[in-house]
Amino acid sequence: VTGSRVYPANEVTLLDSRSVQGELGWIASPLEGGWEEVSIMDEKNTPIRTYQVCNVMEASQNNWLRTDWITREGAQRVYIEIKFTLRDCNSLPGVMGTCKETFNLYYYESDNDKERFIRESQFGKIDTIAADESFTQVDIGDRIMKLNTEIRDVGPLSKKGFYLAFQDVGACIALVSVRVFYKKCPLTVRNLAQFPDTITGADTSSLVEVRGSCVNNSEEKDVPKMYCGADGEWLVPIGNCLCNAGHEEQNGECQACKIGYYKALSTDASCAKCPPHSYSVWEGATSCTCDRGFFRADNDAASMPCTRPPSAPLNLISNVNETSVNLEWSSPQNTGGRQDISYNVVCKKCGAGDPSKCRPCGSGVHYTPQQNGLKTTRVSITDLLAHTNYTFEIWAVNGVSKYNPSPDQSVSVTVTTNQAAPSSIALVQAKEVTRYSVALAWLEPDRPNGVILEYEVKYYEKDQNERSYRIVRTAARNTDIKGLNPLTSYVFHVRARTAAGYGDFSEPLEVTTNTVPSRIIGDGANST
């Protein structure tokens, strides 16, 4: 039965005489008159089993003491720590020549754990042990004991176990403690890799290469390796592991991020506090959930704050110029926490009688510099219809607007375009041609831009080349031009007039009067 004694973590004890309860019962030769097992008391009045010999009177002493069989436990090199008291021969009168101040340490490897006799020839000498000057004065209760400590090592060992033996050649000595141990590099965690207990190599300069395994919740970055040195110290760590996402290093372990913290990637970074406007409700979060009403864009890093769509633009000003509108506004009061703000323009054409009946303006309207994705806070809108109610909405948008579009993000203004000259008449036709007259008809302009007050027909003889023309005005969309010369080519132009003025003349219509009466219906082509 052995009691518990504390030794360095890199030493594994195979034998400790101080821990044995009761007699050690080692084998002495000779059986009497040589080594003797004697109890001395420690400071707690607990007996310490020692082996003593003090045969300093007789020359040629050869007293052997052999331990029980000691298992090797896979160790190739073992260490023997001997604590002993050796009496100075000068303190013993009349023993010059017979008194010695050394003893010898031997070992014998064996697979047999029950060898009963000491066969001196089987033993190999480890060393001669002498008391050096570095003894310690150990207080055994209220008594002082000079204690020497010597450590020797032996190896490589190959059999299952071994015996140690102490040979006295005439010293006055007490073996107070015999401890046999081997060295190991103790289980350790380095760079988040766990390295197992590793027995040191066979010789005092050997290095044992050991591969580590990543601790829980971590992964290899580079293959973790270390070397176990002969003294039981780990050397030259190579490679490492990194804590998985959602975990951070704490005391050589990968701990889950606490609630309210997160870690997005396998790095050596610590968990970070959830960015503004986000939270985590579980331990081990790899990202944080955005607060209600806040969002993360697809390309936003997990470390970025959650953001929200911007508020509406401010101070929208409109400036109507006939059928064009210039709009200007200010940035929103709240950008939602983002820099990627832009503006979209929505144009709606609304009925005069019922403003709620609006429909999209369509593709005929033009926007400068553009309709969507505006980075500036102004836009020009052209090619609108005159005398028309328009509602323009300016939407402030950012990277997260698509997740929560809301009318709160836009501002609108309703305008009415001014009177404007009508557009040109697209089609003029000669309905009837005689020797002295031409009957004309035409369509209303595509964009009257108001109420058409009248049409103006301009005509002239073709060979006069507009040097001398005549004007006929009519409120109707047809008219008879009389008083013409027979067999003469005439060119006709028609334009419309509103309160805003005349529109452009139509394309020319060329008609030649007849020599004899006839009825011609033209399609806008030249009539002969």
Epitope: C54, N55, E58, P93, T98, A174
Partner: antibody
């Protein structure tokens, strides 16, 4: 068993000599030193010295040099104390005692019964 | 040489009581004294030597302690056969005895 046997009382005149034997038995005589102790009547113990029974090398305490001689006859496992030129103040019980040497302290673990030497004219 | 002084010269105790005997060295010593018991008309008997090691046959009511210059022999419960004279003895290249303490019945 281990024992030390001393001779009986001796009465001597001043100036005479006496040789006190101490015969050992029950152990290897040459393995242990033999010590001699004097105790004057009504007094305490005085250590006189010892002799290495293996080499015959004697050690004398202060005050016991010159007239006092330790000797051996290993063939009969006997130690001797010889006192010459006896004086009245040599009257005492003389004990032989086997020496017990250890690392942590010495003692005399086996004693003879003592020999009373009386010096009287 | 080292002089050992024992005190008290005489100690009166009743059977069953504890007895404490002192032995003081004239200078600090690195070892512990041996203790002997001597009854009238008998040779001394070794009680304790070394690091308070009891000699063969000595009961465990006898114990020794001390270091440096002051040493003590303690009889935890005095028995009738313990009444005697007790000597301390210092070893080294030269041995000396104390003058003795007589333990008598109270």
């Amino acid at each position: 068993q281990v024992q030390l046997l001393q001779s009986g009382a001796e009465v001597k005149k001043p100036g005479a000599s006496v040789k006190v034997p101490c015969k050992a038995s029950g152990y290897t005589f040459t393995s242990r030193a033999m010590s001699w102790v004097r105790q004057a009547p009504g007094q305490g113990l005085e250590w006189m010295g010892w002799i290495n029974t293996n080499t015959g090398n004697p050690t004398y305490a202060q005050g016991f040099t010159g007239r006092f001689v330790f000797s051996l006859d290993t063939s009969v496992s006997t130690a001797y104390l010889q006192i010459s030129s006896l004086k009245a103040e040599d009257t005492a019980v003389y004990y032989c005692a086997r020496v017990r040497l250890t690392v942590y302290g010495d003692g005399m673990d086996v004693w003879g019964q003592g020999t009373l030497v009386t010096v009287s004219s | 040489e080292i002089v050992l002084t024992q005190s008290p010269a005489t100690l009166s105790v009743s059977p069953g009581e504890r007895a404490t005997l002192s032995c003081r060295a004239s200078q600090s010593v690195s070892s512990n004294p041996a203790w002997y018991q001597q009854k009238p008309g008998q040779a001394p008997r070794l009680l304790i030597y070394g690091l308070s090691t009891r000699a063969t046959g000595i009961p465990d009511r006898f114990s020794a302690s001390g270091s440096g210059t002051d040493f003590t022999l303690t009889i935890s419960r005095v028995e009738p056969e313990d009444f005697a004279v007790y000597y301390c003895q210092q070893y080294g290249p030269s041995w000396t005895f104390g003058q003795g303490t007589k333990v008598e019945i109270k």
